[in-house]
């Protein structure tokens, strides 16, 4: 029950997180005009990953897309890439985790397969969250650097009475959405990984079974069966026999008194 709850909660938290990452990526307010210590402006500037906007006091808002690809700063391109990778990984993670949910029955899917899928989606959510946090943090660092650079040259061309105020940009709402969303996706991923441990069967079938051939004392060791799902190699064996079966870790490589019937 606790495992199902943990898995379900992890899924929901990750879903909210990924929705937030998508929202942050699409938002225009990654950087907003710094109004502190500035004249009260009738024109408010803000920028996103894909376009820059101007909101006038008249209520008119005008946005212009960045129609160049090569002319954009490498850092902005890197942030875009990180956010897209985060979204893609998150989306795949969500897809995988839907099938991994304990409350959903798909054919005769084994618990071990569900455990693998849960772990895979968990890892994907963790990487997705980290990508989003990294992307937002890179952009924030870029803003901080530019902010202090423009503060240093705040007033350029002080020829006579004329002043040209450089527009300084500060953190926009999208950064906070991105940080929170990345954190939620990360937490959701960790919860999925925790749920995976509870989903995985504690015991597996015998790895080495001895058959007493009549008149002979020969040990027969068949190659242990692995329930492979393609979602990872660290799989546990399916439990077929309860009577004193042991996990892979307990299997000894040398003959013991348990090897013979």
């Amino acid at each position: 029950m606790a495992v199902t709850a943990c898995q379900g909660l992890g899924f929901v938290v990750s879903l909210i997180g990924i929705a937030g990452i998508i929202a942050a990526t699409c938002m225009d307010q990654w950087s907003t005009q710094d109004l502190y210590n500035n004249p009260v402006t009738a024109v408010f500037n803000y920028q996103g990953l894909w376009r820059s906007c101007v909101r006038e006091s008249s209520g008119f808002t005008e946005c212009r897309g960045y129609f160049t690809l090569l002319g954009l700063p490498a850092m902005l391109q890197a942030v875009r890439a990180l956010m897209i990778v985060g979204i893609v990984l998150g989306a795949i993670g969500l897809l995988v985790s839907i099938f991994a949910l304990k409350c959903i029955r798909i054919g005769s899917m084994e618990d071990s397969a569900k455990a693998n899928m849960t772990l895979t989606s968990g890892i994907m959510f963790i990487v997705s969250g980290l990508c989003a946090i990294a992307g937002v943090s890179v952009f924030a660092n870029m803003l901080v650097t530019n902010f202090w650079m423009s503060t240093a040259n705040m007033y350029t061309g002080m020829g006579g009475m004329v002043q040209t105020v450089q527009t300084r940009y500060t953190f926009g709402a999208a950064l906070f959405v991105g940080w929170v969303a990345g954190g939620l996706t990360l937490i959701g991923g960790v919860m999925m990984c925790i749920a995976c441990r509870g989903l995985a069967p504690e015991e597996t079938n015998y790895k080495a079974v001895s058959y007493h051939a009549s008149g002979h004392s020969v040990a027969y060791k068949p190659g242990g069966f692995k329930a492979s799902t393609g979602f990872g190699s660290n799989t546990k064996n399916k439990k077929i026999y309860d009577g004193g079966a042991r996990t892979e870790d307990e299997v000894q490589s040398y003959p013991s008194k348990h090897d013979y019937v």
Epitope: A42, V43, V54, E56, S58, G59, F60, V162, V165
Partner: antibody, heavy 119, light 113 residues
């Protein structure tokens, strides 16, 4: 046809109060930022106050704390409550509309209402 | 506050003449976000409220004759009337639309010679 009609002006003693009204018609009043601009007896134009669609309010420093701009979108009316009036507030008060695509320029002006502050 | 300085204060012209008046702002009215200048020109005829002629420093308001041309960027702006007509005799004001307070210039009075 866009029309802005001001009313409420008159003669008032220093320290007195007056409330100006501006009735807008021929446009969706709630979709526009509105302002009050005055013209002094020396014919200088002076912006007084602005109220945006999002109800952000801006005032000229010399009227801050004395004047209050407000709007009633249901009545298509803009108001300017003027308290603690001074002689320097004597002017012709215009109600103006900021054009939506005119880079914050005032595309329509009323005929104005005269305010005289004198003892 | 942004100070708008207009020159000359008055101009005496003959009909058909080309007229140029200037407006200087104490701070740049060019917005870096969209590379637009937030400056407007108004025409005020006796007994009438001001009328918008030019916005964004160079865009003519609809219905304004094409003899009126606005130019300039940053802090220096110009209003040119290519061929003055009798009905153009008025006071012309420039206005900062970028920063509050939305200040006006003192005006340039266009008179007939």
């Amino acid at each position: 046809e866009v029309r802005l009609v001001e009313s409420g002006g008159g003669l008032v003693k220093p320290g007195g109060s007056l409330k100006l009204s501006c009735a807008g018609s021929g446009f969706t009043f709630s979709s526009y930022t509105m302002s009050w601009v005055r013209q002094t007896p020396e014919k200088r134009l002076e912006w007084v106050a602005t109220i945006t669609i999002g109800v952000n309010i801006y005032y000229l420093d010399s009227v801050k704390g004395r004047f209050t701009i407000s709007r009633d979108n249901a009545k298509n009316t803009l108001y300017l409550q003027m308290n603690s009036l001074r002689s320097e507030d004597t002017a012709l008060y215009y109600c103006t509309r900021l054009g939506q695509t005119q880079r914050n320029a005032m595309d329509y002006w009323g005929q104005g209402t005269s305010v005289t502050v004198s003892s | 506050d942004i100070v708008m300085t207009q020159s000359p204060t008055s101009l005496s012209v003959s009909a058909g003449e080309k007229v140029t008046m200037t407006c200087k702002s104490s701070q740049s009215l060019l917005n870096s976000g969209n590379q637009k200048n937030y400056l407007a020109w108004y025409q005020e005829k006796p007994g009438q409220p001001p009328k918008l002629l030019i916005y964004g420093a160079s865009t003519r308001e609809s219905g304004v004759p094409d003899r009126f041309t606005g130019s300039g960027s940053g802090t220096d702006f110009t209003l040119t009337i290519s061929s003055v007509q009798a009905e153009d005799l008025a006071v012309y004001y420039c206005q900062n639309n970028h920063f509050y307070p939305l200040t006006f210039g003192a005006g340039t009075k266009l008179e007939l010679k």
